[in-house]
Interface confidence: medium
């Protein structure tokens, strides 16, 4: 199944309702409103595949369409990351990747997009409703984050199609700084617009599959009344996920995601700002002025980093961009 | 050409404090993550510290063994690397090395400076 | 923290010989292994990154080969420049490094 979040469709002025201005005289503003709508709302996809060899083994691929800078990716299951989600896998460019079980291999597929491999044995392994969610942290768009899953009736070794239900989501940190100045130029190009007597106040509709309306509501207060109205996340068959889930993980361990940030729209003011924070029984995003720290339950590692090279035959360097060039 | 070189090594005595830096040319300094090693005498490679590029907000991340003790920051407007050791102990004596990287982890250090040395002695 | 055994920790052998190092990881870490040649009072040398992928600069005699847990580290033909010792780390935080392989000349 590959669900994207989807632009917001523009509905074009009725031919009858030209009024006194040419239609050329809009062009301008119809181009900046589309490239402000578009520019404004970064894309989080992901598919989930069933292998056809192993039934119970997923593949889920996530990717961002936005244009910042990577910072970091989690992949979580049962979940947004932060809603009861469960982390499965962490991936930050500079550091590293951490995996747990059931995950077996993380890796990154290209500088704005990653895979992960889940295991199809055992207490731990997922199954076909389990919601499966990447959030990517980026600058300047802050944190956006899809979920997918398969539908029960999938035949295995098919992507599902796309599902209607993608959550898109902002944390408020990652976008008040550049992308609020796009917005706020966005709304007053829109005033601007409606300020023309004989020209309707263009309509944004967003599209079917799409749960975000314009840019403002990608980080509405209520996140997780959003998220309601667009998975239902009470269908999740909780019995494919395993019960050591619901207990506190034990600390120690790999450090250095439990203190991960994603990219906010401030810089930490120091060291101080990255101390390593109590790891809580389940996982979430707590959002702070310097930044996102990742704060996914600690669990024992399985099967360690899951550490897989890019897959372009001339190695890392093929994927030279804002992250690779040496 | 792309250069690192270490300074502000020396004798020590336990307890003290000692900053170490690194000065990069030859290359944007900001683009880089930083990191720091260390070799005591006779023995292998220890990895000390690091702080990331400026893309990931300079985050720093140590060893077990330094954390709460050292601090690694940098400038980019001088292009230096610090690395800031308080509360020395005998068993930081080590050539202490920086190194550029990793841009991408799974890249390496592929740019590293001579060494500086540090001897922690009463 | 993974733990990176290397083996031997030293080696004997003359000139023009295939020199065979491995390094074995704790846990699995995939292809993200990279390997390092040190002599005596210099900075260590990134040599291979990724598991297999050449450095610019290195000679083509040096390669390296494995994924997950097990990697090797092969000099096809010694040259007098490569005795020295070698190091694997792997790549994520915190890093960690092989004890150290040293090959001297028989």
């Known amino acids: 199944m590959r669900t994207e979040a989807q632009v917001p469709a523009l509905q074009p002025p009725e031919p009858g309702l030209e009024g006194a201005m040419g239609h050329r005289t809009l062009v301008l503003p119809w181009v900046l409103l589309t490239l402000c709508v578009t520019a404004g709302t970064p894309e989080v996809w992901v598919q989930v595949r069933m292998e056809a060899t192993e039934l119970s083994s997923f593949t889920i691929r996530c990717g961002f369409l936005g244009s910042g800078s990577i910072s970091l990716v989690t992949v979580s299951w049962g979940g947004p990351n932060g809603a009861g989600g469960t982390t499965l896998a962490v991936l930050h460019p500079e550091r590293g990747i951490r995996q747990w079980a059931p995950a077996r291999q993380a890796r990154w597929e290209t500088q704005s997009s990653i895979s992960l491999i889940l295991e199809g044995s055992g207490a731990s392994s997922p199954c076909a409703n389990t919601t499966f969610c990447c959030k990517f942290a980026s600058f300047p768009e802050g944190s956006w984050e899809a979920c997918g899953s398969l539908p029960p009736s999938s035949d295995p070794g098919l992507s599902a199609p796309p599902t209607p239900a993608p959550i898109l989501r902002a944390d408020l940190a990652g976008i008040l700084g550049v992308s609020g100045v796009l917005l706020f130029g966005c709304v007053y190009l829109l005033h601007l617009l409606r300020r023309h007597k004989h020209r309707p106040a263009p309509r944004l509709q967003p599209s079917r599959t799409s749960p975000q309306a314009p840019r403002a509501r990608a980080w509405a207060p209520s996140q997780a009344s959003q998220a309601a109205l667009h998975v239902p996340y009470a269908t999740i068959n909780t019995s494919c996920r395993p019960a050591t889930l619901d207990t506190a993980h034990p600390h120690g361990g790999p450090s250095w995601w439990a203190s991960l940030p994603t990219h906010a729209a401030h810089r930490p003011q120091g060291p101080a700002a990255w101390a390593s924070t109590p790891i809580p029984a389940r996982g979430s995003f707590v959002s702070v002025e310097n930044g996102l720290y990742a704060q996914a339950g600690e669990r024992p590692p399985h099967t360690g980093p899951g550490l897989t090279l890019f897959p372009d035959p001339r190695g890392p360097r093929a994927m030279e961009g804002p992250l690779g060039v040496r | 050409e792309v250069q690192l070189v270490e300074s502000g090594g020396g004798l020590v005595q336990p307890g003290r404090s000692l900053r170490l830096s690194c000065t990069a040319s030859?290359?944007?300094?900001?683009?880089?993550?930083m990191s720091w090693f260390r070799q005591a005498p006779g023995k292998g490679l220890e990895w000390v510290g690091f702080i990331g590029s400026k893309a990931y907000g300079g985050t720093t991340e140590y060893t077990a063994s330094v954390k709460g003790r050292f601090t690694i920051s940098r400038d980019g407007s001088k292009s230096i690397a610090y690395l800031q050791m308080n509360s020395l102990k005998t068993e930081d004596t080590a050539v202490y090395y920086c190194?550029?990287?990793?841009?991408?982890?799974?890249?390496?250090?592929?740019?590293w400076g001579q060494g500086t040395t540090v001897t922690v002695s009463s | 923290d993974i733990q990176m055994t290397q083996s031997p920790s030293s080696l004997s052998a003359s000139v023009g010989d295939r020199v065979t190092i491995t390094c074995r990881a704790s846990?699995?870490?995939?292809?993200?292994l990279n390997w390092y040649q040190q002599k005596p009072g210099k900075a260590p040398k990134l040599l291979i990154y990724a598991a297999s992928s050449l450095q610019s600069g290195v000679p083509s005699r040096f390669s390296g080969s494995g994924s997950g847990t097990d990697f090797t580290l092969t000099i096809s033909s010694l040259q007098p420049e490569d005795f020295a010792t070698y190091y694997c780390q792997q790549s994520s935080t915190p890093l960690t490094f092989g004890g150290g392989t040293k090959v001297e000349i028989k």
């Open positions: 190194a550029r990287g990793p841009r991408r982890y799974t890249y390496g250090m592929d740019v």
């Open positions: 846990q699995s870490i995939s292809s993200y």
């Open positions: 030859g290359f944007t300094f900001g683009d880089y993550a």
